[in-house]
């Protein structure tokens, strides 16, 4: 048993059948000594008395806030929450599988540039009694801050017959140093609580590889005299780090017919400006990515052709 | 160049070597991002190659202030991945393919190194370890790593060339 | 819990073959080499050989000849044989971990030791 | 092969007071590509196996004091007890792991004068 936050505890669980449970003991938070009695959630019934409450904790039953009382009055709470483990594996019940970029992915981050700044999110099935807490580091065996901001609930998107929750969370390194190669990984720890069920999630990444630019700005064509090319020009994205000189992005820029089934004409160049072809009812869409470290594209921008 | 006393290096021939790096390094070894290998108790390995550091002064206020400190790292750091891609950890079984860019990536390193010292200057004499033996199946992990570093590393000197060939070339 | 233990014949006759075992549990063979050390009594730490994580081994050139260090990785056990046994090989003798990685590294966790005494 | 020179071979000092030991290698420990000193300090107390204290030169173990620090680089090295402990009156030995064969120094006394 280990203390969550105050008064909140979380009792491990290995989850078989006729698993012997977990004995706990729990203390009233209390100077009385004498007529203290314990009861567990909205029950009157009467657990136990004296300081101290042995109970063996087997299942969800067993879990839940135990309140001391004297004479009526509430003395201190307890709540506990179970924390399973199912063939030496604790469980994922509360959030989804995203399975990308690979399997038993629970929580993905992305950051915009290289200012320390991230953004983490996670999809669950649950719509209520569900509370999340983040926190990060930069490294495990001597961790340097991250500040992350309060869970927040992002998206709600129909699936079939169920409904999928997206919550999100930004994060900020402390000490962020854009220009230096990351040595150590950034951590990220959520602990996920759904009624009397707790969880925790895992992310370890560094900076650089979960880079996704935002889509080029200001994406303009000027037609070029007596001819069917037009010059495309672009700009770096606001959200991308400066100065553009040392934080240098590549591009690609695709020609693309009305129909998926045209054939996309690419160019790739580090310049903010290209020359295509363009057809008719066709788009110009130009995507970013980091010139020297090959981490995600962005998003096209595009533009139609006529 | 990059000379005692601080004189520039060639810094749009240093672009281009480290551009070329950083293109090799990703064609030597193309698995973007998240095969994560932090999960094979990569610690050590990562904390055993060079880094680029904040106080390493390789930042665009730094290489304004003074590009040296950042370009004898980036040689330090050139230095010592090209003795790893010459050990045996690359050379040994299983051999490397006839086309691997891991050849030419080395050769890139050398050539970007002696860019940045060229005859009769020396910077302290690089010494580098005695490499623990490995076997062919710790050979593949640990190439696995050492690109995946490298990979990072000449990102940044690309950025420093880069910067340096727009903002402090002659 | 980290743990090395060893055993091993503490008393030998002058030509014969010493031989120790070094059981290791709490961590796993594919990340760490085993080393032995030896210290003759009031005197220093002289390092004896490895045995690396994938199997080879490496001495001290002046054991080489007649050391032999070896792994049964069923049983997470390492032995040292040392040969031709003479007076100089009165010595302490520890088993210690280092952690596999692109160099060679330092000893973090010994074996209790073991005292081999050789005398006729 | 790296040779550890260590001095002074004893250190005559009372509880409290401050204790420094040098580390002397043949040739440089110092690896610059990745800013790493090869070099390890431990201690023995009769009848033990030696304890890790630092590593990489500077970096305490974990669960050692903090009056235990590691300094140097290169070729010069030292251990420092910032205000000697009781306990702390053992042999201290450096170990080089740069080159192998790993080698030791030859081991300082610090006695309770």
């Known amino acids: 048993i280990w203390e969550l936050k105050k008064d909140v505890y979380v009792v491990e669980l290995d989850w078989y059948p006729d698993a012997p449970g977990e004995m706990v003991v729990l203390t009233c938070d209390t100077p009385e000594e004498d007529g203290i009695t314990w009861t567990l959630d909205q029950s009157s019934e009467v657990l136990g008395s004296g300081k101290t409450l042995t109970i063996q904790v087997k299942e969800f039953g067993d879990a839940g806030q135990y309140t001391c009382h004297k004479g009526g009055e509430v003395l201190s709470h307890s709540l506990l929450l179970l924390h399973k483990k199912e063939d030496g594996i604790w469980s994922t019940d509360i959030l989804k599988d995203q399975k990308e970029p690979k399997n038993k992915t629970f929580l993905r981050c992305e950051a915009k540039n290289y200012s320390g700044r991230f953004t983490c999110w996670w999809l669950t099935t649950i719509s209520t009694d569900l509370t999340f807490s983040v926190k990060s580091s930069r490294g495990s065996s001597d961790p340097q801050g991250v500040t992350c901001g309060a869970a927040t609930l992002s998206a709600e998107r129909v699936r079939g017959d169920n409904k999928e929750y997206e919550y999100s969370v930004e994060c900020q390194e402390d000490s962020a140093c854009p220009a230096a190669e990351e040595s150590l990984p950034i951590e990220v720890m959520v602990d996920a609580v759904h009624k009397l069920k707790y969880e925790n999630y895992t992310s370890s990444f560094f900076i650089r590889d979960i880079i996704k630019p935002d889509p080029p700005k200001n994406l303009q064509l000027k037609p070029l005299k007596n001819s069917r090319q037009v010059e495309v020009s672009w700009e770096y994205p606001d959200t991308w780090s400066t100065p553009h000189s040392y934080f240098s992005l590549t591009f690609c820029v695709q020609v693309q017919g009305k129909s998926k089934r045209e054939k996309k004409d690419r160019v790739f160049t580090d310049k903010t400006s290209a020359t295509v072809i363009c057809r008719k009812n066709a788009s110009i869409s130009v995507r970013a990515q980091d010139r020297y470290y090959s981490s995600s594209w962005s998003e096209w921008a595009s533009v139609p052709c006529s | 160049r990059a000379v005692p006393g601080g004189s520039s290096p060639a810094w749009t021939q240093c672009q281009q070597l480290s551009q070329k790096l950083c293109t090799l390094a990703w064609s030597a070894h193309p698995l973007v991002g998240h095969m994560d290998l932090r999960e094979e108790g990569d610690e050590e390995t990562t904390n055993d190659v060079p880094h680029i550091q904040c106080g390493d002064g390789c930042d665009p206020q730094g290489l304004r202030d003074n590009s040296q400190f950042c370009l004898q790292r980036i040689h330090q750091g050139l230095i010592f991945y090209e003795k790893l891609l010459g050990s045996d950890i690359f050379t040994g079984e299983p051999s490397l393919l006839p086309d691997s860019p891991v050849g030419q990536l080395h050769a890139s390193l050398l050539g970007l190194s002696q860019l940045l010292q060229p005859e009769g200057h020396h910077w302290e004499t690089q010494q580098i370890p005695s490499l623990s033996p490995s076997q062919p199946w710790q050979r593949l992990l640990l190439r696995f790593k050492i690109l995946r570093s490298l990979q990072a590393f000449v990102a940044v000197a690309a950025r420093v060339f880069a910067h340096g060939a727009a903002t402090l070339s002659p | 819990e980290v743990q090395l233990q060893q055993w091993g014949a503490g008393l030998l006759k002058p030509s014969e073959t010493l031989s120790l075992t070094c059981a290791v549990y709490?961590?796993?063979?594919?990340?760490?080499?085993v080393h032995w050390i030896r210290q003759p009594p009031g005197k220093g730490l002289e390092w004896i050989g490895v045995i690396w994580t994938g199997g080879s081994t490496d001495y001290n050139s002046v054991l080489k000849s007649r050391v032999t260090i070896s792994v049964d990785t069923s049983k997470n056990q390492f032995s040292l044989k040392l040969s031709s046994v003479t007076a100089a090989d009165t010595a302490v003798y520890y088993c210690?971990?280092?952690?596999?990685?692109?160099?060679?590294?330092?000893?973090?966790?010994w074996g209790q030791g073991t005292l081999v005494t050789v005398s006729s | 092969e790296i040779v550890l020179t260590q001095s002074p071979a004893t250190l005559s000092l009372s509880p409290g007071e401050r204790a420094t030991l040098s580390c002397k290698p043949s040739?440089?420990?110092?690896?610059?590509?990745?800013?790493?000193?090869?070099l390890a300090w431990y201690q023995q107390k009769p009848g033990q196996a030696p304890r890790l204290l630092i590593y990489?030169?500077?970096t305490r173990q974990s669960g050692i004091p903090d009056r235990f620090s590691g300094s140097g680089s290169g070729t010069d090295f030292t251990l420092t007890i910032s205000r000697l402990e009781p306990e702390d009156f053992a042999v201290y030995y450096c170990l080089q792991h740069f080159n192998y064969p790993w080698t030791f120094g030859g081991g300082t006394k610090v006695e309770i004068k």
């Open positions: 040739q440089s420990l110092l690896s610059s590509g990745n800013r790493k000193n090869y």
């Open positions: 709490g961590f796993s063979l594919i990340s760490y080499n």
């Open positions: 990489y030169a500077s």
């Open positions: 210690a971990r280092d952690k596999y990685g692109l160099f060679p590294g330092y000893f973090d966790y």
